[in-house]
C-alpha cells in the first residue's frame, strides 16, 4: 500500500541544491562603492533571480546559460543594504518553480560601523601578576579587531575573528592602564567602527 499517513517528501535536497550568493568586494562597504553580487548554481542554469526576502517582486533577473550570474549594484547607498537571496531555474522546470533560495547574504552599506563594547573578564580590577582578558564585542562576524592603550600610539594587539567579538590577553604586570578598541572590515575597501568607550584596568 502506498498511502502512508506521513506525507512523502521528494526529491532529496542534493537533487537540485540551493545556490551560493557572495559579494565583491565585500559584504560591508561604504556608500558609493560598486558592489557585485554573484549567484553560483551547482549546475548550469537558464535564469537567475536576485531578491530581498519579504519582497514579492524580484530585484533583478539574469538570463545566462551558465552556473554563474552577476548582479551589479552601482554606487550603493545605505538603502540598498539589507538581506539578499538568489534562486535559479531551468527551462524545463514547471512554471514558476525555482530552486530553493541561497542562504541570506547581509549587505551593509555604512560610513561607520557601530561602536563596540570593551569589557574585562573576569573584571577590571586584577590582582598583582594576574592576567586579564579584554573582550571587544561588535555586531558583525569576520572582522578585524584592534586594541589600543592610552599613551601608546601604535595598536597594542590585532585579532581577526569569525565571531562578532575578539578576546585580548593582557599579562598581569603590564595590565593596568586605560584601553579602547575598534574593529574594521578585514580587507579593502575598509570600513571602520567608532572607538569603544575606554576601560580602566587597575590593580587591587
Amino acid at each position: 500500500d502506498i498511502t502512508p499517513s506521513v506525507a512523502i517528501i521528494v526529491p532529496p535536497a542534493s537533487y537540485h541544491p540551493k545556490p551560493w550568493l557572495g559579494a565583491q568586494p565585500a559584504t560591508v562597504v561604504t556608500p558609493g562603492v560598486n558592489v557585485t553580487l554573484r549567484c553560483r548554481a551547482p549546475q548550469p542554469a537558464w535564469r537567475f533571480g536576485l531578491f530581498k526576502p519579504g519582497e514579492i517582486a524580484p530585484l533583478l533577473f539574469r538570463d545566462v546559460s551558465s552556473e554563474l550570474a552577476e548582479f551589479f549594484l552601482e554606487e550603493v547607498t545605505p538603502a540598498q543594504g539589507g538581506s539578499y537571496r538568489c534562486c535559479y531555474r531551468r527551462p524545463d522546470w514547471g512554471p514558476g518553480v525555482w530552486s530553493q533560495p541561497s542562504d541570506v547574504l547581509e549587505l551593509l552599506v555604512t560610513e561607520e560601523l557601530p561602536r563596540p563594547s570593551l569589557v574585562a573578564l573576569p573584571g577590571p580590577v586584577v590582582g598583582p601578576g594576574a592576567n586579564v582578558s579584554l573582550r571587544c564585542a561588535g555586531r558583525l562576524r569576520n572582522m578585524s579587531f584592534v586594541l589600543y592603550r592610552e599613551g601608546v600610539a601604535a595598536p597594542l594587539q590585532y585579532r581577526h575573528s569569525a565571531q562578532p567579538w575578539a578576546d585580548f590577553t593582557l599579562l598581569g604586570a603590564r595590565a593596568p592602564g586605560t584601553y579602547s578598541c575598534y574593529y574594521h572590515t578585514p580587507s579593502a575597501p575598509y570600513v571602520l567602527s567608532q572607538r569603544s568607550e575606554v576601560l580602566v584596568i587597575s590593580w587591587e
Epitope: V10, P11, Y15, F51, A57, C87, R90, D92, G96, W98
Partner: antibody
C-alpha cells in the same frame, strides 16, 4: 512532520465570495512554490493557481480575474480568495507544494466548497 | 476537455501488468517532465512518479514511469487489489500546470 491543512470551505451562494487557507508546517514555507488544485465531484484534477518563491502568481485561464492567490510567509499560510463564485466552482480544493523539476509532492487533505442557492 | 489525454478506464487481474497512457504535445510532455498520481477513493492524490521515471521513497518498484516523444506511460506490475484507484498524469507548459482526465483502474476478481 510535514503537514498541509486547508480550511475555509463551506456553502456559499452563487455570486458570493470565500477565502480558503492552507497552513503548512514542517517546511521553510517561503522557500517553495505553493499551489491550489481543485476536483469537482466525480471529476478529475484541475490546476487553479500557483504562488512562486518570488515574482507574479500564475493562474489557469478560467480563474484569472475571479480568484486571487496570496501567501503570508510569516504565518506559513497560503490563501485563495474566490470571488463571483458559480455553481461549477463546487469542488474539493487542495493545496499542494511543488517540487523540482515540476510535480506536486505534498498535498493537503482538501476542503469542500459548495456553491448553491 | 483535458489537454493531456488518458483512457478513462483500465483493468487487470491480480498479478498482471497494466499500462496507462498519457498523450500530450510538444509544448507540454514533449519538452517537459511528466508526473503520475494515485488517488484512492475519498483521499487526496499521492505522488507516484516524478521527473518521468523517478519514484518517491515509499513507492513500491512495481510502479514505473516512462516518456517517449509527446506521450508518457505508467506501468503497474504485479497488480494488487489495493492498486484500485484513479491515476492522473501531469505535466506543464510555459505558464500552466496540466492534468490528464484520469484513468480509473479496476482490479478484477
Amino acid at each position: 512532520e510535514v503537514q498541509l491543512l486547508e480550511s475555509g470551505g463551506g456553502l456559499v451562494q452563487p455570486g458570493g465570495s470565500l477565502r480558503l487557507s492552507c497552513a503548512a508546517s514542517g517546511f521553510t514555507f517561503s522557500d517553495y512554490y505553493w499551489t491550489w488544485v481543485r476536483q469537482a465531484p466525480g471529476k478529475g484534477l484541475e490546476w487553479v493557481s500557483g504562488s512562486p518563491v518570488f515574482g507574479a502568481a500564475n493562474y489557469a485561464q478560467n480563474f484569472q480575474g475571479r480568484f486571487t492567490i496570496s501567501r503570508d510567509n510569516s504565518k506559513n499560510t497560503l490563501y485563495l480568495q474566490m470571488n463571483s463564485l458559480r455553481a461549477e466552482d463546487t469542488a474539493v480544493y487542495y493545496c499542494a507544494k511543488a517540487g523540482i523539476p515540476g510535480h506536486f509532492d505534498i498535498w493537503g487533505q482538501g476542503t469542500l466548497v459548495t456553491v448553491s442557492s | 476537455q483535458s489537454v493531456l489525454t488518458q483512457p478513462p478506464s483500465a483493468s487487470g487481474t491480480p498479478g498482471q501488468r497494466v499500462t496507462i497512457s498519457c498523450s500530450g504535445s510538444s509544448s507540454n510532455i514533449g519538452n517537459n517532465y511528466v508526473s503520475w498520481y494515485q488517488q484512492l477513493p475519498g483521499t487526496a492524490p499521492k505522488l507516484l512518479i516524478y521527473g518521468n521515471s523517478n519514484r518517491p521513497s515509499g513507492v513500491p518498484n512495481r510502479f514505473s514511469g516512462s516518456k517517449s516523444g509527446t506521450s508518457a506511460s505508467l506501468a503497474i506490475s504485479g497488480l494488487r487489489s489495493e492498486d484500485e484507484a484513479d491515476y492522473y498524469c501531469q505535466s506543464y507548459d510555459s505558464s500552466s500546470w496540466l492534468f490528464g482526465g484520469g484513468t480509473k483502474l479496476t482490479v478484477l476478481g
